[in-house]
């Protein structure tokens, strides 16, 4: 019997981390700056990096630009988009910006996009200034199943921050659905 | 039999519980404002509260202003600074600010630093108005191992809200790294 | 004994799954924009949506404007609060705005209310620019005791953007207290 | 990188009058806070008027009254007035801009700066 509890507990350990291991997914996507779209209306951003810096993904996809889930449950998801304009770059356009991401979700069974996340701000970004920045951060709960994808979408994309640090959106599984 | 499956049940909730308390290190370390340095420019904020107020840690290490992992594994990482002008403390030199946070990881087997996150904004605080306020929020999912340190670097220090409520940082560990 | 481990793994699946699930009560709410107060001053939000769109709630309990703790733990908390106005909603008082949200904690035993957490900024929108758009995300890792109420107050809550994806709050537990 | 030219320095007899200007090379020179400082050979540089971005101003108790410093930022331009000048203010009067620290009062001293001109030259005559 003893042999047996040392069986069923070493059995256990092993199954215990396993079992957690696989039931937390996550990812942490930074952007991949040498695809950006150009343009100042709302567009989905594409390309971002999933296996370098600090950019990783464990039991979800990176697939055409979006991140899909592969299991069922409740995910923390979030977002930190860096925007920037220097005078070297030339003049803004309009120095009165709408600087915005919004963090969507698609199901491919039921062909529909739903925003589950929105941030921003108008800005005045005026010439009296060499250099302009803001940022935005977005976080939230949310009930996603397998199959279904998150991305991106942002306003102004070619003044997007293009460091690692600046522009980014991940995920992680915090529990099962019951 | 009986009694040794409640001895082998007694004993898996006892170690369940136990190692889940154990892989989970956090901390909330809020603004110690006593000790805050001068300068507009990029500056490391190392005075901060650990047992205080909402300030709290567990199985991580606090030490000479930063906050030390003891414990390999992916944690989500926040921070949220808040800056602040009243006319009472004094005129402006700029109107034109830039109130930015870097969230750093230093490593000290390969003394190196890198940021993993930042956040900010470029501001017009006209002297029209007696009151600004501006508050930048970060977080991410970021593997950490032991021994790596994480801090804090801000611009404008002097212009930051001393409030627990306002300018903090913290951790907490999701999941054991594969 | 092959049939008893057998049980006892089968019992222990059970046990760790019910118990993991019992462990972690969220709530992700969004904001009922049918009853939104006036004003520009400081003001509670007491409408919020638990169940329908992306709001949820599970072993925690919406009531009275409040989000009620069930189950003492660590939490991490979270708000996203919009704010907008469109030249078409008729002129604004004053250009000049204090956009502010507070994350606040309400014993009962002891009655008492504090800020866990603040953030925001001061704004001037100008009648130059037919729209404004402000985001303020805040988030923080803290400890809940059964019975303790989290609610948001805001400044400003007439110009709220209405939106689930745009004005929400959320918590989910992250662990046991030791 | 902002370069600062003065200029209007020269030889005044004491009660005269000067007016110093001094040029920026950006057109941002609207976002950074301007200051004037004075030197005689064999002292420290000396602080004489600060002008914030808005064109709030602080003076070394020496000139109060009789100084006025002055900024356009339409033509990048930074001015000081000096009336009633004294002997005592011959000095190579230098322009700086800086903005590396947020409150007016810091920029009484020198470190706050990031720019500074090559200086022009006053001499005040008895």
């Known amino acids: 019997i003893r042999a047996e509890k040392a069986m069923v507990d070493g059995s256990w350990l092993d199954l215990a981390k396993r079992s957690k291991l696989e039931a937390q997914p996550f990812a942490h996507l930074t952007i991949n700056a040498t695809d950006i779209p150009s343009g100042s209306h709302k567009v989905s951003l594409s390309s971002w990096y999933h296996d370098r810096g600090w950019a990783k993904i464990s039991n979800m996809t990176f697939s055409n630009g979006k991140l899909i889930v592969n299991q069922d449950g409740f995910y923390y998801l979030y977002a930190n988009i860096c925007f920037r304009h220097h005078e070297t770059s030339g003049d803004l356009a309009t120095e009165y910006l709408q600087l915005m991401v919004y963090v969507t979700k698609t199901s491919i069974k039921i062909p529909s996009s739903h925003t589950l996340m929105k941030g921003g701000s108008t800005k005045y970004w005026s010439g009296n200034s060499e250099f302009h920045f803001y940022s935005i951060n977005v976080g939230g709960f949310f009930k996603l199943r397998s199959g279904e994808e998150i991305s991106i979408e942002v306003s102004n994309p070619s003044l997007l921050d293009p460091d690692q640090d600046a522009t980014y959106f991940g995920a992680f599984k915090v529990r099962d659905i019951d | 039999i009986r009694a040794e499956k409640a001895m082998v049940d007694g004993s898996w909730l006892d170690l369940a519980k136990r190692s889940k308390l154990e892989a989970q290190p956090f901390a909330h370390l809020t603004i110690n404002a006593t000790d805050i340095p001068s300068g507009s420019h990029k500056v490391s904020l190392s005075s901060w509260y650990h047992d205080r107020g909402w300030a709290k840690i567990s199985n991580m290490t606090f030490s000479n202003g930063k906050l030390i992992v003891n414990q390999d594994g992916f944690y989500y990482l926040y921070a949220n600074i808040c800056f602040r002008h009243h006319e009472t403390s004094g005129d402006l030199a700029t109107e034109y600010l830039q109130l930015m946070v870097y969230v750093t990881k230093t490593s000290i087997k390969i003394p190196s630093s890198h940021t993993l996150m930042k956040g900010g904004s470029t501001k017009y605080w006209s002297g029209n108005s007696e009151f600004h306020f501006y508050s930048i929020n970060v977080g991410g999912f970021f593997k950490l191992r032991s021994g790596e340190e994480i801090s804090i670097e801000v611009s404008n220090p002097s212009l930051l809200d001393p409030d627990q409520d306002a300018t903090y940082f913290g951790a907490f560990k999701v999941r054991d790294i594969d | 004994i092959r049939a008893e481990k057998a049980m006892v793994d089968g019992s222990w699946l059970d046990l760790a799954k019910r118990s993991k699930l019992e462990a972690q009560p969220f709530a992700h709410l969004t904001i009922n924009a049918t009853d939104i107060p006036s004003g520009s001053h400081k003001v509670s939000l007491s409408s919020w949506y638990h169940d329908r769109g992306w709001a949820k709630i599970s072993n925690m309990t919406f009531s009275n404007g409040k989000l009620i703790v069930n189950q003492d733990g660590f939490y991490y908390l979270y708000a996203n609060i919009c704010f907008r106005h469109h030249e078409t909603s008729g002129d604004l008082a004053t250009e000049y705005l204090q956009l502010m949200v507070y994350v606040t904690k309400t014993s009962i035993k002891i009655p008492s209310s504090h800020t866990l957490m603040k953030g925001g900024s001061t704004k001037y929108w100008s009648g130059n620019s037919e729209f404004h758009f402000y985001s303020i995300n805040v988030g923080g890792f803290f400890k809940l005791r059964s019975g303790e109420e989290i609610s948001i107050e805001v400044s400003n809550p007439s110009l709220l953007d209405p939106d689930q994806d745009a004005t929400y709050f959320g918590a989910f537990k992250v662990r046991d207290i030791d | 990188e902002v370069q600062l030219v003065e200029s209007g320095g020269g030889l005044v007899q004491a009660g005269g009058s000067l007016r110093l200007s001094c040029v920026a090379s950006?057109?941002?020179?609207?976002?950074?806070?301007m200051g004037w400082f004075r030197q005689v050979p064999g002292k420290e540089r000396d602080f004489v008027a600060a002008?914030?971005?808005?064109?709030?101003?602080i003076y070394a108790d020496s000139v109060k009254g009789r100084f006025a410093i002055s900024r356009d930022n339409a033509k990048n331009t930074v001015y000081l007035q000096m009336n009633s000048l004294k002997p005592e203010d011959t000095a190579v009067y230098y322009c700086?801009?800086?903005?590396?620290?947020?409150?007016?009062?810091?920029?009484?001293?020198?470190?706050?700066?990031?720019?500074w001109g090559q200086g022009t030259q006053v001499t005040v005559s008895s």
């Open positions: 700086a801009a800086g903005n590396r620290e947020p409150y007016l009062r810091q920029y009484t001293a020198s470190n706050p700066y990031d720019y």
């Open positions: 950006k057109r941002t020179f609207a976002s950074y806070a």
């Open positions: 002008i914030t971005t808005g064109s709030i101003t």
